[in-house]
C-alpha cells in the first residue's frame, strides 16, 4: 500500500490556446486530469489501473501552482494504491479548458482540450521527488513526481506491513524495511523475549521484562548462581540445591552434630589437653595440680598426706613442705632421731626396739596408722570407690566423684546412657556394659539413627532431556533443574521457538 | 492439532471465587510463541477480555478486573487457570480459553468451546 | 478506555459484498483481528494483523485498516457466512474487543 504523489509546478500557455489552437474565450480557465496506470511500452488509451484524479481549476492560461499540501492536499496530486508497488508505471497528464463550473468530462466539449502528454518508465520507492518538464508546440508543464509508502508499509515495493508496538505481543519499532528493530532490553524474533540481568545464569534464572533475574527453584542471588542447601543446614554448604555438605567439625544430616568440640567451645580449662572423643564429647588430660573434668579443679598436693610421723603439709606453688615434729627430719619426715625411751607412739601405740635400739617401730591400734600411729586411718587407702572412682577424703569423712555413667555413694550405680535419648529418629535405645546401642526404624541407620537412607527419589530417573535430579531430603521427593531449552516440574516440556513471519 | 478445554463448577454463589482450569492438549503450553488468555460472553452480549498470560508465568489484566482476577500456569500439567473473587449476576457469562499467537500480532487462533458459569444463590 | 465501534447489524443478499467497519481512536496504527461466531459455536479467527488470513479461512474474507477504519470484506456473500463478527485490537497491554456486527 502506498501512494503516487504528482506535484504540478507551473503550466505555460501563453497564447491561451486549446490544442485545436482555438484560443479560449476570454482564456484557458485550466484544469487537468491525470490518469496512472500499469506500463505500456506505448501508452494508449484504456482503463487508469493504478488510479484517477481531477484538480479544480489552477489557474488562466500561463500560472504557477501553489502547493497546497498543508491545506487540503490538492497538490501534491494523491494517487493512492492498494498493491505492491510494481516498479514501473504509465502516466497521462491533459490539460481541459473549463468553460463553466462543470468540470465532468461529459459536460465538456471534446475539443476543450488544451494538451496531453503521456510518460513511461520506472520508479523506485523513495522520498526524493522527481522533476519533470514536457514541452509542446504551444505549452510547456512542469511537475515533479514520487512513490511513497503508506503509514505502517515499507520496503522496496510498500508491501511491508509493520505497526511499531510495545506490549507483551513485541516492543518493537519498524526499520526502513520493514524488519522489526527491538527496543533496548528486548530480543527475538517478535521482540518479545526480555534480556535479563547481566550474568543472569542461563539455567538457572529467567526473567519477564529487562534486567530482572528471576531463580528457578532450589537456586537463589542476584544472579541466580547461588544453590538453595537442604533446608535446616546448619554448618554445612551445597554445590547443587538441596545438599548440605558438612563444614569441618560437623556432622549429620542438617549439619548440627558437633564432631569437633574441642575447637569449638574449649572446654579444658587451665593449660589442659582437649581431644575429641565423639558427637559433642570430648576428654581433658590435666596438667599436674588439677582435677576435674575440665581440669577446673585445682589439686592441693598435701590432700594425699605425704608428711609421716605427725609431720604438717603445707602447699606451695611448686609443690608442698613438711615441718617436721621433733626427732624426725627428711623430705616426708621419715627419718626419726627417738629411741623407745622418748614414748614416740601416740594414740595408745605400743614401741618396739629395732637395731639395738638405735630405732623403734609402733604398733598402733585400729583406726591409727603412721610412723608413729599419729593418723587416723585414711578411709580411702581401701579404695572404696567403685568403676574407677577417685575417692576424696574431706576431714573426717570422704566423697566419691564419680566417673561419667556412674552414680551412688560408691559410684556403685551404673547411669543408663538411655536415660538422654541418644537414638535419634525413633531408635530403641539399649544400655551395654561399656555403652550403649541403638536399633534403628526402616529408612535410619548410624550409631545413633542420625543417617537416613530412605529411598532415593532419583533412582527412577524421573527428568526428562538430561535434567539433574535432587533428592528433597525433608520430603522425599526431587526437584529436577532444567537445561536451557525446557521447562517443567520434569523437564518434560520443551521452549518452543516462534515460527517465522508469514509475509 | 491443539485443544483446549475448560472445566470448573457451572454455578458459583454471590461474593465467592469463581474457579475456571484450561487444559491444553496436542501441544505445549510452554512454547514460547503464545499467551494464553481467558474471554468471556455474558448471554446475548459481546466478548470480554479477561487477561492472559506466559509460560514464564507472566500475567496482564483487563484493567476493569484486575482487582478481582488471578490467572496462573501449571507447565507440569499444561493448563492454566482463572480465579475471580467477589463474583455478581454481572459476572453470569460463558467463558473460554484461547491461545493468543505473538505471530498473529496477538489474535486468537485457537478457542475452548467455552464452559457457562451463572453466579446465582 | 479503549473503545471499539462496530455497526449493530449489515444486511446483504447471497452473491454481494458485505462490509462490517470498525471504527477506534488512530486505529490504523494498531494491528486488527476479526472473529466469526455462530450461535452456539466458539469464536473463529478469520483476519489478523488487518488483512491475513489464518490457513482454512476462504479467500472471500479480507481486510483492510487505515486511519480510524477497520474493515472486514465478504466477496460473494454465501448463506453460511450469516454469524456474529467482532473486531479485536490491543491497547497497551489490554485486548479490546468490539460490540459486534449481525451479518444476515
Known amino acids: 500500500s502506498g501512494v503516487f504523489q504528482l506535484q504540478l509546478q507551473e503550466f505555460i500557455n501563453e497564447r491561451g490556446v486549446l490544442a485545436s489552437g482555438r484560443p479560449c474565450e476570454p482564456g484557458c480557465r485550466t484544469f487537468f486530469r491525470v490518469c496512472l496506470k500499469h506500463f505500456q511500452a506505448v501508452v494508449s488509451p484504456g482503463p487508469c489501473t493504478f488510479g484517477t484524479v481531477s484538480t479544480p481549476v489552477l489557474g488562466t492560461n500561463s500560472f504557477a501552482v501553489r502547493d497546497d499540501s498543508s491545506g487540503g492536499g490538492r497538490n501534491p496530486l494523491q494517487l493512492p494504491f492498494n498493491f505492491t508497488w510494481p516498479g514501473t508505471f504509465s502516466l497521462i497528464i491533459e490539460a481541459w479548458h473549463a468553460p463553466g463550473d462543470d468540470l465532468r468530462p461529459e459536460a465538456l466539449p471534446p475539443d476543450a482540450l488544451i494538451s496531453k502528454i503521456a510518460i513511461q518508465g520506472s520508479l523506485a520507492v523513495g522520498q526524493n521527488w522527481l522533476l519533470d518538464e514536457q514541452t509542446s508546440t504551444l505549452t510547456r508543464l512542469r511537475y515533479s513526481y514520487r512513490v511513497i509508502c503508506s503509514d505502517n508499509y515499507y520496503g522496496d515495493n510498500c508491501s511491508r506491513l509493520c505497526k511499531k508496538r510495545n506490549d507483551h505481543f513485541g516492543h518493537y519499532v519498524c526499520q526502513p524495511d520493514g524488519n522489526l528493530s527491538c527496543l533496548p532490553g528486548w530480543t527475538g524474533e517478535y521482540c518479545q523475549q526480555p534480556i535479563c540481568l547481566s550474568g543472569c545464569h542461563e539455567q538457572n534464572g529467567y526473567c519477564s521484562k529487562p534486567a530482572e533475574c528471576l531463580c528457578r527453584p532450589g537456586w537463589q542471588g542476584r544472579l541466580c548462581n547461588e544453590c538453595i542447601p537442604h533446608n535446616g543446614c546448619r554448618h554445612g554448604t551445597c554445590s547443587t540445591p538441596w545438599q548440605c555438605t558438612c563444614d569441618e567439625g560437623w556432622g549429620g544430616l542438617f549439619c548440627d552434630q558437633d564432631l569437633n568440640y574441642c575447637t569449638h567451645h574449649s572446654p579444658c580449662k587451665n593449660g589442659a589437653t582437649c581431644s575429641n572423643s565423639g558427637q559433642r564429647s570430648y576428654t581433658c588430660t590435666c596438667r599436674p595440680g588439677y582435677t576435674g573434668v575440665d581440669c577446673e579443679l585445682e589439686l592441693s598436693e598435701c590432700d594425699s598426706n605425704p608428711c609421716r610421723n605427725g609431720g604438717s603439709c603445707k602447699d606451695q606453688e611448686d609443690g608442698y613442705h613438711c615441718l617436721c615434729p621433733p626427732g624426725y627430719y627428711g623430705l616426708h619426715c621419715e627419718h626419726s632421731t627417738l629411741s623407745c625411751a622418748d614414748s614416740p607412739c601416740f594414740n595408745g601405740g605400743s614401741c618396739r626396739e629395732r637395731n639395738q635400739g638405735a630405732n623403734y617401730a609402733c604398733e598402733c591400734p585400729p583406726n591409727f596408722t603412721g610412723s608413729n600411729c599419729e593418723k587416723k586411718v585414711d578411709r580411702c587407702t581401701s579404695n572404696p570407690c567403685a568403676n574407677g572412682g577417685q575417692c576424696l577424703n574431706r576431714g573426717p569423712s570422704r566423697m566419691c566423684r564419680c566417673r561419667p555413667g556412674f552414680t551412688g555413694t560408691y559410684c556403685e550405680l551404673h547411669v543408663s546412657d538411655c536415660a538422654r535419648n541418644p537414638c535419634a529418629h525413633g531408635g530403641t535405645c539399649h544400655d551395654l556394659e561399656n555403652g550403649l546401642m541403638c536399633t534403628c526404624p526402616a529408612g535410619f541407620s548410624g550409631r545413633r539413627c542420625e543417617v537416613r537412607t530412605s529411598i532415593d527419589a532419583c533412582a527412577s530417573s524421573p527428568c526428562f532431556n538430561r535434567a539433574t535430579c535432587y533428592t528433597d531430603l525433608s520430603t522425599d521427593t526431587f526437584v529436577c533443574n532444567c537445561p536451557y531449552g525446557f521447562v517443567g516440574s520434569r523437564c518434560e516440556f520443551p521452549v518452543g521457538l516462534p515460527p517465522s513471519f508469514p509475509w | 492439532e491443539v485443544q483446549l478445554q475448560e472445566s470448573g463448577p457451572g454455578l458459583v454463589k454471590p461474593s465467592e471465587t469463581l474457579s475456571l482450569t484450561c487444559t491444553v492438549s496436542?501441544?505445549?503450553?510452554?512454547?514460547?510463541?503464545?499467551?494464553w488468555g481467558w474471554i468471556r460472553q455474558p448471554p446475548g452480549k459481546g466478548l470480554e477480555w479477561i487477561g492472559d498470560i506466559y509460560y514464564t508465568g507472566s500475567t496482564y489484566y483487563n484493567p476493569s478486573l484486575k482487582s478481582r482476577v488471578t490467572i496462573s500456569v501449571d507447565t507440569s500439567k499444561n493448563q492454566f487457570s482463572l480465579k475471580l473473587s467477589s463474583v455478581t449476576a454481572a459476572d453470569t457469562a460463558v467463558y473460554y480459553c484461547a491461545r493468543q499467537a505473538v505471530m498473529y500480532g496477538g489474535g486468537s487462533d485457537n478457542w475452548g468451546q467455552g464452559t457457562l458459569v451463572t453466579v446465582s444463590s | 478506555s479503549y473503545e471499539l465501534t462496530q455497526p449493530p447489524s449489515v444486511s446483504v443478499s447471497p452473491g454481494q459484498t458485505a462490509s462490517i467497519t470498525c471504527s477506534g481512536d488512530?486505529?490504523?496504527?494498531?494491528?486488527v483481528s476479526w472473529y466469526q461466531q455462530k450461535p452456539g459455536q466458539s469464536p473463529v479467527l478469520v483476519i489478523y494483523?488487518?488483512?491475513e488470513r489464518p490457513s482454512g479461512i476462504p479467500e472471500r474474507f479480507s481486510g483492510s485498516n487505515s486511519g480510524d477504519t477497520a474493515t472486514l470484506t465478504i466477496s460473494g456473500t454465501q448463506a453460511m457466512d450469516e454469524a456474529d463478527y467482532y473486531c479485536?485490537?490491543?491497547?497497551?497491554?489490554?485486548?479490546?474487543f468490539g460490540s459486534g456486527t449481525k451479518v444476515t
Open positions: 496436542g501441544g505445549s503450553i510452554s512454547s514460547g510463541s503464545y499467551y
Open positions: 488512530s486505529l490504523g496504527d494498531k494491528y
Open positions: 494483523e488487518d488483512s
Open positions: 479485536q485490537a490491543w491497547d497497551s497491554e489490554t485486548g479490546v
